[in-house]
Amino acid sequence: AVNGTSQFTCFYNSRANISCVWSQDGALQDTSCQVHAWPDRRRWNQTCELLPVSQASWACNLILGAPDSQKLTTVDIVTLRVLCREGVRWRVMAIQDFKPFENLRLMAPISLQVVHVETHRCNISWEISQASHYFERHLEFEARTLSPGHTWEEAPLLTLKQKQEWICLETLTPDTQYEFQVRVKPLQGEFTTWSPWSQPLAFRTKPAALGKDT
């Protein structure tokens, strides 16, 4: 597949994990491949085995240390190599000079909870997970609410242009079941992308009081 299209994409979670996906047209599903990480100014190096995730796509996580340890900084460059086994030898398939803080994707927000719920509004909070202290407050969030009879894709996006780990949802319908998700993105990094969406939080608005319009 030398003339086929390939893609090697990696993201740093800002703490101790680099997640990589390698895809190549025409590659065999049972091909054995690895990602090797060689930092330019660290004493460690790391390897992970690429495992199939689809027909011609493999993924793995380079675990650099304890989940909340700060293993890389803005000045680090990590040379990432994809190596695949060909007979008895390993062949280098791709190489990337990886700048961790230019290629960020944080973990999904966690610990979503309903702080207060009424008939027409709901206050929800969350926490960010394994996010570097380097960001200080330079984060933004997107949130969406799933209404009955709609899909997540139809849900309008609510943008929070600052590090605000709560939201007050307004104009909700009384006695109605909703679901809520949030994701996070640092402002830093040319190739930085949104985190995965959080696990959905289900909540129900309170019923309207009888004989009263709330």
């Epitope: 299209t5 390939s6 460059i77 190599r81 190489i95 990337q96 000079d97």
Partner: nanobody, 123 residues
């Protein structure tokens, strides 16, 4: 946009040497990894060698390993291909290419291309 201009091609006897240069310019050029490909008459374009801009990590085609050396001069935004032990089968139009992030052996993984410089090896 990124401009890539190759030079250094020519006619050389078998066993001889040549050094190709590829000068990169343009506001969009941003430490892109670079590669060399070649296309002989009537054949498909094939990978020769590639180098990452920052660490200088290299990839080579098996057919040129040990004979060709790719290098780069960051201060001049230029990539070189030093070719020695040239063979008649190395005769081709040599293209310089730039990738956005990753070097591979696949031509489709490279975004920007030069016009090429001709290398002819006589027996």
């Amino acid at each position: 946009e990124v401009q890539l201009v190759e030079s250094g091609g020519g006619l050389v006897e078998a066993g001889g040497s040549l050094r190709l240069s590829c000068a990169a310019s343009g506001r969009a050029f941003n430490n892109f990894p670079m590669g060399w490909f070649r296309q002989a008459p009537g054949k498909e374009r094939e990978f020769v060698a590639a180098i990452t801009w920052i660490s200088g990590s290299t990839l080579y085609a098996d057919s040129v390993k040990g004979r060709f050396t790719i290098s780069r001069d960051k201060s001049k935004n230029t990539v070189y291909l030093q070719m020695s032990g040239l063979k008649p089968e190395d005769t081709a139009l040599y293209y310089c290419a730039a990738a956005l992030k990753t070097i591979t052996r696949g031509q489709h993984d490279y975004t920007y291309w030069g016009q090429g410089t001709q290398v002819t090896v006589s027996s």
